[in-house]
Interface confidence: low
Amino acid sequence: FERTRSLQDPCSNCPAGTFCDNNRNQICSPCPPNSFSSAGGQRTCDICRQCKGVFRTRKECSSTSNAECDCTPGFHCLGAGCSMCEQDCKQGQELTKKGCKDCCFGTFNDQKRGICRPWTNCSLDGKSVLVNGTKERDVVCGPSPADLSPGASSVTPPAPAREPGHSPQ
């Protein structure tokens, strides 16, 4: 079948990195600069992606594969194939339309991207708070009082104290 197809369509003989040039009697011509063909039998080469502005080049374009972009420092990729770059924030912050904002009290973000998430509610699992949460870290839940052996000192949940100067938003 392949042999028959190639007799009927001479373009099928053109390998990746070339295109079937109708203007030159269907000769396989190399892709021009800044273009590529990742499969054989192509009648045109695709224009290479250019990593501009906030995008930077992770992999250069070759005649057989497109360029791949990532983001300049301070930004991270979003979307398939890094179609967008979004500004990084610090841990303990989230990105809003007005820039990076501190997580509200009772929430945390341990990454430079994404949104602030509520602290784990230890009591839902019948556990107590072993370590307080912060803007950057979730609470650590400890064993429930029932899990403690008789005579052992129970773990008292510390009272949640506001961080100095940090008001809820």
Epitope: C51, K52, G53, V54, T57, T72, G74, C85, Q87
Partner: antibody
Framework: QVQLKQSGPGLVQPSQSLSITCTVS????????VHWVRQSPGKGLEWLGV???????DYNGAFISRLSISKDNSKSQVFFKMNSLQADDTAMYFC??????????WGQGTTLTVSS | DIVMTQSPSSLAVTAGEKVTMRCKSS????????????LSWYQQKQGQPPKLLIY???IRESWVPDRFTGSGSGTDFTLTISNVHAEDLAVYYC???????????FGGGTKLEIK
Amino acid sequence: QVQLKQSGPGLVQPSQSLSITCTVSGFSLTSYGVHWVRQSPGKGLEWLGVIWSGGSTDYNGAFISRLSISKDNSKSQVFFKMNSLQADDTAMYFCARDRGGGFDYWGQGTTLTVSS
Amino acid sequence: DIVMTQSPSSLAVTAGEKVTMRCKSSQSLLWSVNQNNYLSWYQQKQGQPPKLLIYGASIRESWVPDRFTGSGSGTDFTLTISNVHAEDLAVYYCQHNHGSFLPYTFGGGTKLEIK
């Protein structure tokens, strides 16, 4: 810390060319683009062109026929060349780092006077 | 090319006053994909290169005091300086940097003078 240092001539004759080197430190040219901007005496800022981190360039259409920007990543140098200079090209020329959303660090500027 | 129009071209204020300057673009600088406005503000003092003040229309650079506020979206943008200090004496430029609309262009500048 991040720095961009420019070197180039101060006086050029009409019809001659201008070459400026922008040597950067504190960051890699494989991670950031570098723009060129000029400022004529008493006037505002005019964007001339850019070389992106991957090596591709974009130019202001008004200068595309006589402007060339290139770079040497290993030497952390960006090269700016403008041909066919006339008196109205007299200006301060700056290189500046692209940070995505703005030009966050600028060179000290190269003063060019085009005069015979 | 996108045309950036700044107003007023100059203004003189007394230290401590509030100042508002405007920048209007001939095309929208709002990118619907990420809701970012590709507009920056620069401050240029006499004999110095410009300094990036605000990007994304409203996000202050780390060195910028919070008396500087950028606002606006689409085609209309504002830079406000509340409680002007003597060291704010400078020319302020807006610039579009939407990569889909090359060339990047700057406004004509607003010169801030202190009485």
